[in-house]
């Protein structure tokens, strides 16, 4: 009778992660008597995948009943495939022997390749906020994909970016891979509503790329512009001075009025108006009792925005030149409010 051959008809099998792999194997004869075993890899370090008679292999099932008389189909199914299962699988026939069974004949092997989807890209920006005209770096990471080929693109508000560097690790053969990319983005004053998008395309995604986003509102700081103006007299001996704080982001802002360098009042921006570009405006006003001053008054609006060093704008109030106006003689006071309460 012809000597037994072990036939593995599939040279390679491609399976998606999470699916079941079927590895086919048939023998051409029932002789010699002995079990079939499946291994991943060859040589002394090979890994036992299935032994039909003993051991624990919860992920493996046989395609046919191996104990049926005259069965020569030794195909197996491996469930819940992960990238770690990739490799070459050998169906090996053993001959019963003493003390141990002896390897008799091996199949040619079936290479199992696993396609695994990349994880959702995670985009992270700089730890500290930056101001317009500065360049900031964003990183994008995705893990666990196989095969290694992958495409990564960066966008800002739908416009593709070109200033980025990408690495896929490891460089050599691996069960799965990771991608890491760093993009440089120049901030503009209009970027409060902007988004940076990292897009990853891979064979497992069937043309539907994964995206990770970062909002530039988390990254940008737009410093305010200040304007101090003197309003017409509201009452006898009183001058209304306003400080317009324009186009700032984020909202965290504290304003201090100084009269001739002395703190008059401090307030925190509360009811602000939002501009179309996402920045904020706010206004504070101060009633100055002119009669309390003999000399000219230097009024300073000092603003501390988002924990940054204070910026200020001053206005010189000429006491001597101030005309008197008819009207009720209210008590001299310093009051402040936001835009809503001026009129």
């Amino acid at each position: 009778e012809e000597e037994l051959q072990v036939i593995q008809p599939d040279k390679s099998v491609l399976v998606a992660a999470g699916e079941t792999a079927t590895l086919r194997c048939t023998a051409t004869s029932l002789i010699p008597v002995g079990p079939i075993q499946w291994f991943r890899g060859a040589g002394p370090g090979r890994e036992l995948i299935y032994n039909q008679k003993e051991g624990h292999f919860p992920r493996v099932t046989t395609v046919s009943d191996l104990t049926k008389r005259n069965n020569m189909d030794f195909s197996i199914r491996i469930g819940n495939i992960t990238p770690a299962d990739a490799g070459t699988y050998y169906c090996v026939k053993f001959r019963k022997g003493s003390p141990d069974d002896v390897e008799f004949k091996s199949g040619a092997g079936t290479e199992l390749s696993v396609r695994a989807k990349p994880s959702a890209p995670v985009v992270s920006g700089p730890a500290a906020r930056a101001t317009p005209q500065h360049t900031v770096s964003f990183t994008c990471e995705s893990h666990g994909f196989s095969p290694r080929d992958i495409t990564l693109k960066w966008f800002k508000n739908g416009n593709e970016l070109s200033d980025f560097q990408t690495n896929v690790d490891p460089v050599g053969e691996s069960v799965s891979y990771s991608i890491h990319s760093t993009a440089k983005v120049v901030l503009t004053r209009e970027d409060v509503h902007s988004q940076v998008i990292c897009e990853v395309a891979h064979v497992t995604l069937q043309g539907d790329p994964l995206r990770g986003t970062a909002n530039l509102s988390e990254t940008i700081r737009v410093p305010p512009t200040l304007e101090v103006t003197q309003q017409p007299v509201r009452a006898e001996n009183q001058v209304n001075v306003t400080c317009q704080v324009r186009k700032f982001y984020p909202q965290r802002l504290q304003l201090t009025w100084l009269e001739n360098g002395n703190v008059s009042r401090t307030e925190t921006a509360s009811t602000v108006t939002e501009n179309k570009d996402g920045t904020y405006n706010w206004m504070s006003w101060l009633l100055v009792n002119v009669s309390a001053h003999r000399d000219d008054v230097k009024l300073t609006c000092q603003v501390e925005h988002d924990g940054q060093p204070a910026v200020s704008k001053s206005h010189d109030l000429k006491v001597s030149a101030h005309p008197k106006e008819q009207g009720s003689n209210t008590a001299a006071e310093n009051t402040g409010s936001n835009e809503r309460n001026i009129y």
Epitope: V33, P44, G45, R46, E47, L48, Q52, K53, E54, G55, H56, L66, T67, K96, P99, D100
Partner: antibody, heavy 113, light 108 residues
């Protein structure tokens, strides 16, 4: 559900023979090797041997070779372990196990004069 | 015959502590054929870890196994009261199959 149910405790005199049974359910006994393991009181596990019920091929540990016989009856899905020329040091719990993964509850054999 | 030597013979620890149990083989054992069993008094052994590092069904993730060649380890990251038992390593790489003498993990 895989189950291995062993026969009850035995008390034997030195020189006697004991035969323990292990009836299995939830699988066909022909599909797996059936192993036997000894555990003397307060001691560790010791592998005795195994049978391939499909063709009755057996392997035994050198320590038990010549005194132990493992058999199987595929019609009743039962494995047996027979130990002869009993001595006091054979006093132990004997376990059957299916392919190293599932174990019977154990059978206590006491050898005493 | 491959002799498996487990150390220590007894390990006294408190719940919450990390336990490291060792199993040393007199000659090389393929990692596929190295199993660990847990046994409690009056009970049959239970398969705990198979093929060196794979947890049997229902075994908590605080257990892990590692090793290759002649040196294998079972680790419990943070001991729970139910983990105190005897643990045996077992090789079925070549006949006669052998067990280690066991490590008794007891409450300190």
């Amino acid at each position: 559900e895989v189950q291995l149910v062993q026969s009850g405790a035995e008390v034997k005199k030195p020189g006697a023979t004991v035969k323990i049974s292990c009836k299995v359910s939830g699988f066909n006994i022909k599909d797996y090797y059936m192993h036997w393991v000894q555990q003397a009181p307060g001691k560790g596990l010791e592998w005795i041997g195994r049978i391939d019920p499909e063709d009755a091929e057996t392997k035994y540990a050198p320590k038990f070779q010549g005194r132990v016989t493992i058999t199987a009856d595929t019609s009743t899905n039962t494995a047996y372990m027979e130990l002869s020329s009993l001595r006091s040091e054979d006093t132990a719990v004997y376990y059957c196990d299916r392919g190293l993964a599932y174990w019977g509850q154990g059978t206590l054999v006491t050898v005493s004069s | 015959e491959i002799v498996l030597t487990q150390s220590p013979a007894t390990l006294s620890l408190s719940p919450g502590e990390r336990a490291t149990l060792s199993c040393s083989a007199s000659s090389s054992v393929s990692s596929s054929y190295l199993y660990w069993y847990q046994q409690k008094p009056g009970q049959a052994p239970k398969l705990w870890i198979y093929s060196t590092s794979n947890l049997a069904s229902g075994i908590p993730a605080r257990f892990s196994g590692s090793g290759s060649g002649t040196d294998y380890t079972l680790t419990i990251s943070s001991l729970e009261p139910e983990d105190f038992a005897v643990y045996y390593c077992h090789q079925w790489s070549s006949y006669p199959y052998t067990f280690g003498q066991g490590t008794k993990l007891e409450i300190k």
